[in-house]
Every structure is written in structure tokens, then in C-alpha cells.
């Protein structure tokens, strides 16, 4: 058993049929010595008396808010949560496996630049009685500070018969140099509590590996005389690290119709303009990627050909 | 347009070209190592990230773009240990900081070159003959060093009398390649910045 926060405790249980469970001793936070009784949740049934209560925790029925009283007055509370371990593996029932970039990916994180700010998100099908808390650091043995905000519900989607909820959190490394060469990864830890179930999820990464620039901005077209070719120009996104001659981007320019199966024109360039062939009912799209360290491409920025 | 439009300094341009070749060569070598040593811990997640130039050179600090010198977090360990003149820029343009930066890059390359050559000598003794360093990568390191044209003492190649542990050598190769790739990215950024300035 360990303390998650004040008056909230996590009991780690090996979860299998007829498991013996864990013996837990609760102590009432009071100078009083006698006349103390214990109850669980809203029940008035007295579970025991005395300053300490010893319980055998085997299942979710044994978890919950234990309260010690004296003469009708509440003295203190202890909330017990369960953390299940099945076949040596901690349960991951609360969050959905996003399976990208690999299986067992519950947390996904992205950074728009090298400033040390990043966003992580996760998915769940649970809509109520759900809380998250997020901690982060650079490295684990001698951790350096990363400050994370509160996790918020950022999107709701319908997937088949199920509703899916996306939560996200923004974090900022306390003293980040955009030009630094990372040797210790960022660690992100998410505590998830659903009713009386506790789970924790972690992710470890270098900012350089989660970079995904914003799409290029200000796409403009200039038709070339006596040709089917069009000059398309754009600018670096405002959120990208500066100076741009140091933090350079490379671009992919594509002309394509509505369907992915349609024919297309595609060209890669380090410049902020390119010449392509425009077709009726097609769009010109441009996306960006760090020129020197190939992490993710940005989303496309698009303008219609006509 | 956001990128500074500048006529490339003919003196700088060869270094930019060589640094691009360097990044390409080390990325290819790292990819080859990951594939060949698939049953060794050779991915970014599996290895310890060590920097053999730590406390010996100060490339990131010495080559910091002017725009980032206002960032306190970038100036923690700003050192000024190298004062030399390089040939990548016309000497009249070579400011003190730029000379410091380019000589720091040169020292990095020299250190990695020695490590790679020592390692290759060991790998050549491996009866499995599983992996060797790409001669192209070693040649590209040499070409960039020549383009930088700094004079410094020759670092003797480390020779080892004990029997090499090939497993450890291959893991060390992965560690070295990952670190060198990150440094090559920095070098490429620096050359691009200097070329545009």
C-alpha cells in the first residue's frame, strides 16, 4: 500500500481467483484513543472499533472511503483504491491502446517546435467518475523540472456504438534550450482513477522524436504564362522554432483531386516555393518536416487549384 | 519568405555540402546497424545516450545562433575553449565566436573519427564479420575535417591489448552512432545558419 495523495491510498493486488489479497491497517488521524468506530462509504454498518482497523483487501467491494467516527462526529477519512496486477502485468483497463506507433501505446505526445513545450493525449470510453493527474520530468534518476497543466477533455467522438473521449495535457520543460542535444528523455506519468480503480501510464521520449510542425502558412498561387504550371509559395508556420536558417524545414508539395486514388503531382523542396502542374478540381497541398531530423510531417495546408 | 535570402559565401558552401553528406552517411550507417544488429539493443529507446565529446568540446554552446544567446537556458555552460582560424569562411569574416564554433566542430569530428577507427579495427577481428563501419562515412568525416582545415594535435588511435568483447563493441557502436547522428544534425543546422548569415 502507498499514499497517492493526502488520505488516498493505493492497494496493489495480485488479481487471480481466490487470491489472498492484502492485509491493510488503517489508523484514525485523531488524538482520541477510545470510542472510535469505522464505516465504509455510505453504509452505517460498523466494521470495527478502536484507533486502527485491520482489513483484508481482496476485491473492489473492500475498497472505498473508510471513515472513523466518535459519537457521531467524523474524525478522518481514508480512501482505498485498487491497482490490479494480472499475470505480473498491471491492468490497463481505463485507457484505450492507440496502437500507434506501436502496440501498447496509451499516451501519445507531440511538440510543434523545440521550445520544450509539448502536448500529450489519451483515449478512453469511460465518461464518468474519472480523474487524471499528470507529472513529468527530464530524466528519472536526477529529474529536471517539467511543468504540466491539468488534463482536460479535448474531444468526443462516436466510434461505432461507443463514445470515445480524448483527454489532453500541455507540459513545458522549465529550462529548455531549443538548440540543446537531448541525452535524457522526457518522462510523462499519468495517474488514472476510475471509481475505485487506480492505474498508471507512462511514456518516455525525446522532444526531437515527437516534433510535428504546424502546417505551412499563407499558401499562394501564381499561374505561369503559357504553361499549365503554377508557382506555389508559402511561409514557415508561426509556431516553428527560430531562426529558420538554423531550424530549417523541408516541404512536400502535392497536387491531387478529391480521391486518394487519383493521379497526382508531387515534389519535395527545401525552398518556400515550387512549381507544379495544376488540374481542374484538384487542390495544392503543402506539408513540412524538420529538414535534418526526420520526425513527423505536419498536416497539409491546402488551396484549390482553380 | 522566412528564410534569409543570402548569396552563399563560396568559402562556407563546401562545409554546408560536406555537413549534409555527413548527416546522410551517419544516418545510413545507423540504419544499417539497426537492421544488422536487430537482436542487439540498438534502437534509440534501448541504448544509453552517451556523448564522448562531453566536457571536451562545446559545440552546441559555441555554435549557438545569435537569436538564442538571449535564452538563459542556452547559456548554462557557455565555454570559450578554442580560438583558431578555419578556412570555411573567408578569414576577415571569421569572428571570434565563429572560429570557436568551427574549431569545436573540428574537434568533435576528430574525436569521433578516432573512436570509429578503433572500433572498426575491433570489428574486423570479429569471426562473425557481422558489421563494419561504412568507409563512405569515414571518408565524409575526413572531407569535412579537411574543409574546416584546422591544425590540431593528432589524437593517437587507441590500441587495446586485451581480447575484444564483440558484443560490447557492437553495443558501443550503436551508442556512438546515435550520438554522432545527433551531433551531425547540430553541425548541419550550424552550417545552414552560417551559410545564410
Amino acid at each position: 500500500i502507498w499514499e497517492l495523495k493526502k488520505d488516498v491510498y493505493v492497494v496493489e493486488l495480485d488479481w487471480y481467483p481466490d487470491a489472498p489479497g492484502e492485509m491493510v491497517v488503517l489508523t484514525c488521524d485523531t488524538p482520541e484513543e477510545d470510542g472510535i468506530t469505522w464505516t465504509l462509504d455510505q453504509s452505517s454498518e460498523v466494521l470495527g472499533s478502536g484507533k486502527t482497523l485491520t482489513i483484508q483487501v481482496k476485491e473492489f467491494g473492500d475498497a472505498g472511503q473508510y471513515t472513523c467516527h466518535k459519537g457521531g462526529e467524523v474524525l478522518s477519512h481514508s480512501l482505498l483504491l485498487l491497482h490490479k496486477k494480472e499475470d505480473g502485468i498491471w491492468s490497463t483497463d481505463i485507457l484505450k491502446d492507440q496502437k500507434e506507433p506501436k502496440n501498447k501505446t496509451f499516451l501519445r505526445c507531440e511538440a510543434k517546435n523545440y521550445s520544450g513545450r509539448f502536448t500529450c493525449w489519451w483515449l478512453t470510453t469511460i465518461s464518468t467518475d474519472l480523474t487524471f493527474s499528470v507529472k513529468s520530468s527530464r530524466g528519472s534518476s536526477d529529474p529536471q523540472g517539467v511543468t504540466c497543466g491539468a488534463a482536460t477533455l479535448s474531444a468526443e467522438r462516436v466510434r461505432g456504438d461507443n463514445k470515445e473521449y480524448e483527454y489532453s495535457v500541455e507540459c513545458q520543460e522549465d529550462s529548455a534550450c531549443p538548440a540543446a542535444e537531448e541525452s535524457l528523455p522526457i518522462e510523462v506519468m499519468v495517474d488514472a482513477v476510475h471509481k475505485l480503480k487506480y492505474e498508471n501510464y507512462t511514456s518516455s521520449f525525446f522532444i526531437r522524436d515527437i516534433i510535428k510542425p504546424d502546417p505551412p502558412k499563407n499558401l499562394q498561387l501564381k499561374p505561369l504564362k503559357n504553361s499549365r504550371q503554377v508557382e506555389v509559395s508559402w511561409e514557415y508556420p508561426d509556431t516553428w522554432s527560430t531562426p529558420h536558417s538554423y531550424f530549417s524545414l523541408t516541404f512536400c508539395v502535392q497536387v491531387q483531386g478529391k480521391s486518394k486514388r487519383e493521379k497526382k503531382d508531387r515534389v519535395f523542396t527545401d525552398k518556400t516555393s515550387a512549381t507544379v502542374i495544376c488540374r481542374k478540381n484538384a487542390s495544392i497541398s503543402v506539408r513540412a518536416q524538420d529538414r535534418y531530423y526526420s520526425s513527423s510531417w505536419s498536416e497539409w495546408a491546402s488551396v484549390p487549384c482553380s | 519568405r522566412n528564410l534569409p535570402v543570402a548569396t552563399p559565401d563560396p568559402g562556407m558552401f563546401p562545409c554546408l555540402h560536406h555537413s549534409q553528406n555527413l548527416l546522410r552517411a551517419v544516418s545510413n550507417m545507423l540504419q544499417k546497424a539497426r537492421q544488422t544488429l536487430e537482436f542487439y539493443p540498438c534502437t534509440s529507446e534501448e541504448i544509453d545516450h552517451e556523448d564522448i565529446t562531453k566536457d571536451k568540446t562545446s559545440t552546441v554552446e559555441a555554435c549557438l545562433p545569435l537569436e538564442l544567446t538571449k535564452n538563459e537556458s542556452c547559456l548554462n555552460s557557455r565555454e570559450t575553449s578554442f580560438i583558431t582560424n578555419g578556412s570555411c569562411l573567408a578569414s576577415r569574416k571569421t569572428s571570434f565566436m565563429m572560429a570557436l564554433c568551427l574549431s569545436s566542430i573540428y574537434e568533435d569530428l576528430k574525436m569521433y573519427q578516432v573512436e570509429f577507427k578503433t572500433m572498426n579495427a575491433k570489428l574486423l577481428m570479429d569471426p562473425k564479420r557481422q558489421i563494419f563501419l561504412d568507409q563512405n562515412m569515414l571518408a565524409v568525416i575526413d572531407e569535412l575535417m579537411q574543409a574546416l582545415n584546422f591544425n590540431s594535435e593528432t589524437v593517437p588511435q587507441k590500441s587495446s591489448l586485451e581480447e575484444p568483447d564483440f558484443y560490447k563493441t557492437k553495443i558501443k557502436l550503436c551508442i556512438l552512432l546515435h550520438a554522432f547522428r545527433i551531433r551531425a544534425v547540430t553541425i548541419d543546422r550550424v552550417m545552414s545558419y552560417l551559410n545564410a548569415s
Epitope: 486514388r261 493521379k263 503531382d265 508531387r266 515534389v267 | -
Partner: antibody, heavy 118, light 107 residues
Framework: QVQLVQSGAEVKKPGSSVKVSCKAS????????LHWSRQAPGQGQEWMGW????????EYAPKFQGRVTITADESTSTAYMELSSLRSEDTAVYYC???????????WGQGTLVTVSS | DIVMTQSPLSLPVTPGEPASISCRAS??????LHWYQQKPGQAPRLLIA???QSISGVPSRFSGSGSGTDFTLTISSLQPEDFATYMC?????????FGQGTKVEIK
């Protein structure tokens, strides 16, 4: 299986014209760009131009502009390349090639040898 | 026009050995470079697109690298069927241009 089948070898006199055909099978003809290029003996490939069979748009290499005409007949899934004012240096194997991507070629025809000789 | 220069023009290789062919562009072409294989009397065959993207159905022993002006096609271990002419093609701008070809011969 996508295939491009070209017409047979031709011998032409200098100053005349040649028209080479390229019949496509497999896939929808108008879903692909169609290119023509040539390879003279002992030389590299030389790109001549492309056509979008969907709308008849064409683009030609400046070297061949005014001398080459690329057309397409959607009803027969056939593209044509006509080269006029032939000279001896036009002796080459002419290839048609296609792709959904405009700028490179994933399927080629078998080639048609055109010999220009007096 | 962008001029594509291949080297060497002829490359004698022992079967089972690796081979590397170089292609240089007269100006920077990013990764807009494609590789083809051509055997005598046959149509060219696409091997690599955009400098390093593998093509389905092409053996994994063929790989490409490079960007800017310098590109390399590598065959990790030459098989008897790999003896052919290899050519590069730039797609950075029109007119599309090809290298003159490198003939890989049995040593």
C-alpha cells in the same frame, strides 16, 4: 496486370514524320499520366513530354517543342506520339511510360525502334 | 535543364559483392530522384522513388540514399539477375532528365 504495348519498329526518311502508338491494358486509362521518352544508341534516356488522357493536357520538353505531338484516345486506351521533321539523330528506341504520379514512371512499354535513314 | 551525371559508367562486380552507383545533379533537387534498372532489349523498371522509397516487388537488397545534389543506389549483394544498366532520373523540375546510365557487369 498493367501493361503498355507499343507499335512495331519503323524506318523513316529524313524530313518525314513518325507516329508511334502505345496501348494500355489493366487499370483505367485516364487514371494515369502517360509519358514518352527516347533512348538513342549509347545514350541515356531523354524525356519528351506527357499527356493527361483525362483532359488532353500536354507538356513537352523544350527540345521537342513544335516537333512533337502527344495525343490520347480514351475509347481505345491508346496514346500516340508523333515526331515530325525527322533527322538521323532521331534514330532511337522510343518508350511510353505511365504512372499516377506525374514525374516518374512505374510501368514502361517495351520500346519501339525508329530508324531515320536516307 | 538539370544535368544528371552518373558514375562510374561501367562497374565490374563479383556476384555476391555489394555495389554502389552515384548520381549527381547539377543543382539541388531535394529528394526528387528516382532509380531504374534496364536490361538489354527490355523496358526500364522502377527500383526506388524519391531517393530512398522502396517500391513494392523490388528486392530489399536495393536501397537508395541522398538528397540535394548527391545520390547513391546500393545493391547489398549482387545476384546474377542484377547485372544490368541502372539510371537515375530527376523530377525536381521540367524537363525531366536522366543520368546516362551505369552498366553493372560481371567481374
Amino acid at each position: 496486370q498493367v501493361q503498355l504495348v507499343q507499335s512495331g519498329a519503323e524506318v523513316k526518311k529524313p524530313g518525314s514524320s513518325v507516329k508511334v502508338s502505345c496501348k494500355a491494358s489493366g487499370g483505367t486509362f485516364s487514371d494515369y499520366y502517360l509519358h514518352w521518352s527516347r533512348q538513342a544508341p549509347g545514350q541515356g534516356q531523354e524525356w519528351m513530354g506527357w499527356i493527361d488522357p483525362e483532359n488532353g493536357d500536354t507538356e513537352y520538353a523544350p527540345k521537342f517543342q513544335g516537333r512533337v505531338t502527344i495525343t490520347a484516345d480514351e475509347s481505345t486506351s491508346t496514346a500516340y506520339m508523333e515526331l515530325s521533321s525527322l533527322r538521323s539523330e532521331d534514330t532511337a528506341v522510343y518508350y511510353c511510360a505511365r504512372n499516377k504520379e506525374l514525374r516518374y514512371f512505374d510501368v514502361w512499354g517495351q520500346g519501339t525502334l525508329v530508324t531515320v535513314s536516307s | 535543364d538539370i544535368v544528371m551525371t552518373q558514375s562510374p559508367l561501367s562497374l565490374p562486380v563479383t556476384p555476391g559483392e555489394p555495389a554502389s552507383i552515384s548520381c549527381r545533379a547539377s543543382q539541388s533537387i531535394s529528394i526528387n530522384l528516382h532509380w531504374y534498372q534496364q536490361k538489354p532489349g527490355q523496358a526500364p523498371r522502377l527500383l526506388i522513388a524519391f531517393a530512398s522509397q522502396s517500391i513494392s516487388g523490388v528486392p530489399s537488397r536495393f536501397s537508395g540514399s541522398g538528397s540535394g545534389t548527391d545520390f547513391t543506389l546500393t545493391i547489398s549483394s549482387l545476384q546474377p539477375e542484377d547485372f544490368a544498366t541502372y539510371m537515375c532520373q530527376q523530377s525536381n523540375s521540367f524537363p525531366l532528365t536522366f543520368g546516362q546510365g551505369t552498366k553493372v557487369e560481371i567481374k
